[in-house]
């Protein structure tokens, strides 16, 4: 007996699709060896139609696929657009030749059934409504009208014009006539269920003069659409149930052995397993909606169904659409952290992977909100303004060519806890979900800026310092000016790096930034941060207010004032002013050509007059003595 297992008999009708699953023993060799589907000929030879090596025969071109699922020890052969010529004996198997391990499968494709000429065939999906048309002669215009269903030789009345309705059709069947028509009546049966299928006879009148019509009703169960997605990618279920259920609650459910468990519905129900990674979006007023699930997991594979009912739950006789989702574990999407932890007042740097082939795509970051259907308003993007409430504390740093971008959020509060999505306008599979957990801080932040109430005076020099601990000693320190389209890094010079790490003084590691002279447009948010290459770390933010010099007030160098406020040694304050000229920096390298030109240029952008100097205050005082 063969260790390969599958369906021995598969039967379908022309035009349909089949999905044949073959099961193989779970061994490393089996998982990686060639899988094939071949057709058994009269001569005993089995001609390959499709294989996992990429072979596809002419007769299967454009209508078949073979997909291996090594994690389940199965492979699936999908064949669409069946014709009667597909009827025959096949083998699904493993091995380099078609004589290896195999299982025999018989496929029978029948014609769509034909009925006698007087039989009208009605084909409807589960949950839909059928209108059966019944013609009669004028002589039976005033006679009793009825519709019955054939059960063997008997024909059991479903509904008649005396207002009788079979209990199993109660509230589903109505008999009516349209307008002034004298030769036709109709029977509507709504909320169709599989057992409604069969042969019906409608009748007007009694005895030999009765007019009879045959109607064959076929109730189709949803043919699941097969979806193949990579681990960690996303899937969208597009559900179009028709206008008749436009005003009913919608749901997506996942079938288990017994029922169909609702994952999300428009009444606010949501499965906790999908928290933070699901969105239900109405598409139009005709009942169309879509459900997006991101961060696909292995356990998300399975059978899904969308539907509509006022209860928001699956109900017999209501329209449904079905899918079978396969999740491929051999994913191109890199594994990234699903939970990021931060503390109040601190910051987080979240790395968002994207398809490296689409480095020019627009990048976004949105906050998943749990209201009813779930929604994800964009907070920041490469061409999107930062959302209100996030000014000065949120920025997106694109790293073209690296296949990732970084989103930094600082000044964290516990309200920032929740789920966030990384997405691009390119490959929709590359949507990643991050849960941000913000706990109450139990210690001082790693980065501290002084002075904390920063007010600069127009025309004067203003220096602000960022203190960092020794653990950031080897990392690159930077200052950047935040704006709605990012945080533009200001050039800096790290003197602290000259100091030996052994003698690192925890209290004296400083990166300072000087504005000289201060201009009105210098007002805004500035960030001090650390990074290693493309990897961003901790940041802290400070708002620098800019004001006019009040008339009559003495000219005090704010740098000296800041130093005095800290009770800093005199030489440190002196050193700051000594470096005043040195601190004029420029972001545009073309402007470094002639230092005097920079000093004389009156209308340079704010970044062109800001500088960041990183160093150790201890080192500075040592060098000035």
């Amino acid at each position: 007996q063969s260790p390969i297992f599958g369906p021995q008999d598969v039967s379908s009708i022309e035009g349909n699709s089949v999905s044949i699953t073959c099961y193989y023993p779970d061994t490393s060799v089996n998982r990686h060896t060639r899988k094939y589907w071949c057709r058994q000929g009269a001569n005993g030879y089995c001609a390959t139609l499709i294989s996992s090596n990429g072979y596809l025969s002419k007769e299967y071109s454009g209508r078949a696929s073979l997909i291996n699922f090594p994690e389940n020890s199965t492979f699936v052969i999908n064949i669409a657009h069946l014709t009667q010529e597909d009827t025959g004996s096949y083998k699904c198997g493993l091995g380099t030749t078609n004589r290896g391990l195999f299982f025999d499968v018989s496929l029978e494709v029948s014609q769509v059934p034909e009925f006698p000429n007087d039989t009208h065939v009605y084909t409807k999906d589960i949950g839909r409504t059928v209108t059966i048309e019944c013609r009669f002669k004028e002589g039976n215009a005033h006679s009793k009208k009825s519709l019955c269903k054939k059960r063997g030789e008997a024909c059991e009345v479903v509904i008649d014009s005396t207002e009788y309705v079979d209990p199993s059709y109660k509230d589903r069947a109505i008999l009516f006539m349209k307008g002034t028509s004298r030769d036709i009546f109709y029977v509507n049966i709504s909320h169709l269920i599989p057992s409604d299928a069969g042969l019906y006879v409608c009748q007007a009148g009694e005895g030999p003069s009765a007019d009879k019509n045959n109607a064959d009703l076929q109730v189709l169960e949803p043919e699941p659409e097969l979806l193949y997605k990579d681990l960690r990618s996303s899937v969208t279920f597009e559900c179009d149930l028709g206008r008749e259920v436009a005003n009913d609650a919608k749901y997506l459910c996942r079938k288990n052995k017994e029922t169909c468990d609702v994952i999300i519905n428009t009444l606010g129900k949501r499965d906790p397993a999908f928290e933070g990674r699901i969105l239900l979006t109405p598409r139009d007023d005709n009942g169309r909606f879509s459900v997006l699930i991101t961060g696909l997991r292995k356990e998300d594979a399975g059978h899904y169904q969308c539907g509509a009912h006022s209860s928001g739950l699956p109900q017999e006789g209501w329209p449904v659409q079905a899918w079978q989702l396969f999740v491929n574990e051999e994913s191109t999407i890199p594994n990234s952290r699903s939970v990021v932890k931060g503390v109040t007042g601190g910051s987080v740097a979240i790395v968002c992977p994207y398809n490296p082939k689409e480095s020019s795509s627009l990048k976004y970051w949105c906050h998943w909100e749990a209201d009813e259907n779930g929604r994800c308003p964009v907070l920041v993007g490469t061409q999107a303004l930062v959302q209100e409430g996030y000014e000065g504390r949120l920025a997106l740093f694109d790293q073209p060519g690296s296949g990732a971008y970084t989103v930094i959020l600082n000044q964290l509060t516990t309200q920032d806890s929740g789920f966030y999505w990384c997405l691009t306008d390119g490959d929709s599979r590359w949507r990643t979900t991050i849960e941000l957990q913000v706990a109450e801080a139990t210690k001082k932040p790693d980065l501290e800026v002084t002075p904390q109430n920063a007010t600069a005076v127009i025309g004067e020099t203003f220096t602000i310092s960022c203190h960092y601990p020794c653990k950031f000693y080897s990392q690159e320190k930077y200052w950047c000016k935040w704006s709605n389209d990012g945080c533009h890094i200001l050039p800096s010079h790290d003197e602290g790096a000259r100091q030996s790490s052994v003698s690192c003084d925890q209290s004296s590691q400083i990166v300072s930034m000087t504005l000289n002279p201060v201009k009105k447009e210098d007002e805004g948010w500035y960030w001090c941060g650390v990074k290693e290459g493309q990897v961003y770390g901790e940041t802290t933010a400070i708002y620098v207010a800019v004001e006019e010099r009040t008339r009559g007030s003495p000219h005090i160098n704010p740098t000296d004032a800041n130093a005095r406020a800290k009770d800093a040694p005199e030489e440190e304050a002196m050193e700051s002013s000594v470096r005043e000229d040195e601190n004029k920096a420029n972001l545009d390298p073309r402007l470094f050509a002639d230092e005097r030109e920079i000093q004389n240029a009156g209308d340079q952008a704010q970044e062109n007059r800001a500088s960041g100097n990183a160093g150790s205050a201890g080192g500075q005082s040592g060098s000035s003595k």
Epitope: F5, V10, S12, I13, L220, P224, K257, T259, G302, E316
Partner: nanobody, 126 residues
Framework: EVQLVESGGGLVQAGDSLRLSCAAS????????MGWFRQAPGKEREFVAT??????????YYADSVKGRFTISRDNAKNTVYLRMNSLKPEDTAVYYC?????????????????WGQGTLVTVSS
């Protein structure tokens, strides 16, 4: 919940035929897989045959021991699944259980099926 009721069991001679029926009621609209398992005295319950359907496509699975002798079929309108057993052997003696599921991962696995009938006894004498 889906209720399953088996019928058609009995005592037959080796080589005879029998047809088992399994009628489903309740929330049958979510059921797309129905199968037969059997349990001989002192043995574990084992897979016999399963029918899965999707629209107008049927997939029939059989255990090697019954291939060519047993045939599984269904009547959609009656929510009933049948097992036609030909050329019965004494080793086919067992309680035959009907099982139903909404999904099919591996038809041979008992834990794939959520709903079970009470069983019907088939005795094949030699």
């Amino acid at each position: 919940e889906v209720q399953l009721v088996e019928s058609g069991g009995g005592l037959v001679q080796a080589g005879d035929s029998l047809r088992l029926s399994c009628a489903a009621s309740g929330r049958t609209f979510t059921t797309y897989v129905m199968g037969w398992f059997r349990q001989a005295p002192g043995k574990e319950r084992e897979f016999v045959a399963t029918i899965a359907w999707s629209g107008s496509t049927n997939y029939k699975y059989y255990a090697d021991s019954v291939k060519g002798r047993f045939t599984i079929s269904r009547d959609n309108a009656k929510n009933t699944v049948y097992l036609r057993m030909n050329s019965l052997k004494p080793e086919d003696t067992a309680v035959y259980y009907c099982a139903a599921s909404t999904v099919l991962t591996d038809p041979r696995r008992l834990n794939e099926y959520a709903n079970w009938g009470q069983g019907t006894l088939v005795t094949v004498s030699s």
